[in-house]
């Protein structure tokens, strides 16, 4: 807290300008009127106030707006945003995408702070859904943003927003998140032709079911091994050797290097050894010839 002291003669601020950077903290407190500050917030970010001076300016705004700042002030916070706590931000009502962009710009190049996370949460909740423009903005600043959302939160993403998603935005998504995103992507890209469709859907395939993988295997897509390794194990297991061969095309040779890793390892255990031998890759661990395979899961479903 800055002590209340009288403003020295001739130092009362008539406007927010560069001369204020030479004011000590107590002088800013005593000589800058909070209402003046609020109406001239657009000037604050053009003046290189120090971190400590910003404390005083924040204190003044807090006194003026105890219930939370209006958007006209929030929009121009600039570096003052770095001084805000999540508790401060929870009092705000941010509706403009321009305001969101302006505040994210201040934090650019840094990891997502609790303040930014709270701001985004307030903004998205206020909008009711994660629309394309918002998603475009958020993933531009934070490529990992999408994967930081829970499956429940992701369910509010409309399929049209999926067009804004870049492959790198999904790098840190887990299978539960891809399970939610994949059907949306499938819907979003449904009118594209085969090869274009595969390029777009590829990074979402970690959420694809078996039947979709079977369908892709009929389209000469030549899936790379990196994508294959991210597929759901339960979706890969029912695929036949022929289907995997068609799905991977020339990349099928890469299975050998991955034979000890999931989902390849588990898939090999489910295939007949003589089917695996047809690939000519030396894959071992399949079901020996003459053995009968019982699908117990099917038996349980029938009983």
């Amino acid at each position: 807290e800055v002590e209340k002291t009288a403003c020295p003669s001739g130092k009362k601020a008539r406007e927010i300008d560069e001369s204020l950077i030479f004011y000590k903290k107590w002088e800013l407190e005593a000589c800058v009127d909070a209402a003046l500050l609020a109406t001239q917030m657009d000037r604050v970010n053009a003046i290189p106030f120090t971190y400590e001076q910003l404390d005083v300016l924040k204190h003044k705004l807090d006194e003026l707006y105890p219930q939370g700042y209006p958007e006209s002030v929030i929009q121009h916070l600039g570096y003052l945003f770095l001084k805000m706590s999540p508790e401060d931000i929870r009092k705000w009502n941010v509706t403009s995408l321009e305001t969101l962009k302006a505040l994210l710009e201040v934090n650019k190049g840094h990891e997502m702070s609790p303040q930014v996370a709270t701001l985004i949460d307030r903004f998205v909740k206020g909008r009711g859904q994660l629309d394309k423009d918002t998603l475009d903005t958020l993933t531009a600043f934070y490529p990992g943003y999408l994967c930081s959302l829970s499956p429940e939160e992701l369910s509010s993403v409309p399929p049209s927003s999926i067009w804004a998603v870049r492959p790198q935005d999904l790098d840190t998504c887990d299978p539960r998140q891809l399970d939610v995103l994949y059907p949306k992507a499938r819907l979003a890209f449904q009118n594209m032709n085969g090869s274009e469709y595969f390029v777009k859907i590829q990074s979402f395939l970690g959420g694809a079911p078996t039947e979709d993988l079977k369908a892709l295997s009929q389209q000469n897509v030549s899936m790379d091994l990196a994508t294959f390794m991210k597929l759901r194990t339960d979706a890969v297991l029912p695929l036949t050797v022929a289907e995997v061969q068609k799905l991977l095309g020339p990349h099928v040779e890469g299975l050998k290097a991955e034979e000890r890793h999931r989902p390849v390892r588990d898939w090999i255990l489910r295939q007949r050894q003589d089917d695996l031998d047809t690939l000519g890759l030396g894959l071992q661990g399949g079901i020996p010839n003459g053995y009968l395979v019982l699908d117990l899961s099917m038996q349980e479903a029938l009983s």
């Epitope: 560069e18 950077i21 030479f22 004011y23 000590k24 903290k25 053009a46 290189p48 106030f49 120090t50 971190y51 400590e52 001076q53 910003l54 570096y79 770095l82």
Partner: antibody, heavy 120, light 107 residues
Framework: QVQLVQSGAEVKKPGASVKVSCKAS????????MHWVRQAPGQGLEWMGM????????IYYEKFQGRVTMTVDKSISTAYMELSRLRSDDTAVYYC?????????????WGQGTLVTVSS | DIVMTQSPDSLAVSLGERATINCKAS??????VAWYQQKPGQSPKLLIY???TRHTGVPDRFTGSGSGTDFTLTISSLQAEDVAVYFC?????????FGAGTKLEIK
């Protein structure tokens, strides 16, 4: 990488003016305040002021007000510091420097310095 | 203006030994203090900011500490390449001010 390359040494007579240049590269010139700091022989460092290349806003330390002029030429990413009515105690190495985060005014990058000698 | 008083003016320390440089601010500056290293004929280089945060690429033998008015730069095990003049700077308020410097030499 960020580079600030300054003009060469100058010898001036008392009462004259000197103009030192600082050519920036490796970053967006208009993004950061350009500061000027001087160092008299064997002495500490003294902050003189700053200019924002995007807005041409200048902020001068009171001690130099009226004698210093900071300008920029955006087209060639160059900042200038002119000091007039030179005195012998203005003999110093003059540095340009940039601060990446204005709220944390620590000097992240410096020019190599320009020695200005004021002597009759 | 905030005056930064550095001590000692010069310091001679044996290789591998600890070197300690102090800086005192005339007013409370919180942790808004930076330290610079200046080798002969070169411009200063940022070592520490926020009183204790090492700048990118600075060896961990350099440590900053302190808050309020008293600050310390410590070099835990002096190396030959550490011979230089060291300056503190406050950035709590303008004008930005520096200490007069401490010349560090090898004993």
């Amino acid at each position: 990488q960020v580079q600030l390359v300054q003009s060469g040494a100058e010898v001036k007579k008392p009462g004259a003016s000197v103009k030192v240049s600082c050519k920036a590269s490796g970053y967006t010139f208009t993004s950061y305040w350009m500061h000027w700091v001087r160092q008299a022989p064997g002495q500490g460092l003294e902050w003189m002021g700053m200019i924002h290349p995007n807005s041409d806003n200048t902020i001068y330390y009171e001690k130099f007000q009226g004698r210093v002029t900071m300008t920029v030429d955006k087209s060639i990413s160059t900042a200038y510091m002119e000091l007039s009515r030179l005195r012998s105690d203005d003999t110093a190495v003059y540095y340009c420097a940039i601060i990446i985060t204005p709220v944390v005014p620590k000097f992240d990058y410096w020019g190599q310095g320009t020695l200005v000698t004021v002597s009759s | 203006d905030i005056v930064m008083t550095q001590s000692p003016d010069s310091l001679a320390v044996s290789l591998g030994e600890r070197a300690t440089i102090n800086c005192k601010a005339s007013h409370d500056v919180g942790t808004s203090v930076a330290w610079y290293q200046q080798k002969p004929g070169q411009s200063p280089k940022l070592l520490i900011y926020w009183a204790s945060t090492r700048h990118t690429g600075v060896p961990d033998r350099f440590t900053g500490s302190g808050s309020g008015t008293d600050f310390t730069l410590t070099i835990s095990s002096l190396q030959a390449e550490d011979v230089a003049v060291y300056f503190c700077q406050q950035y709590s308020s303008y004008p930005l001010t520096f200490g007069a410097g401490t010349k560090l030499e090898i004993k």
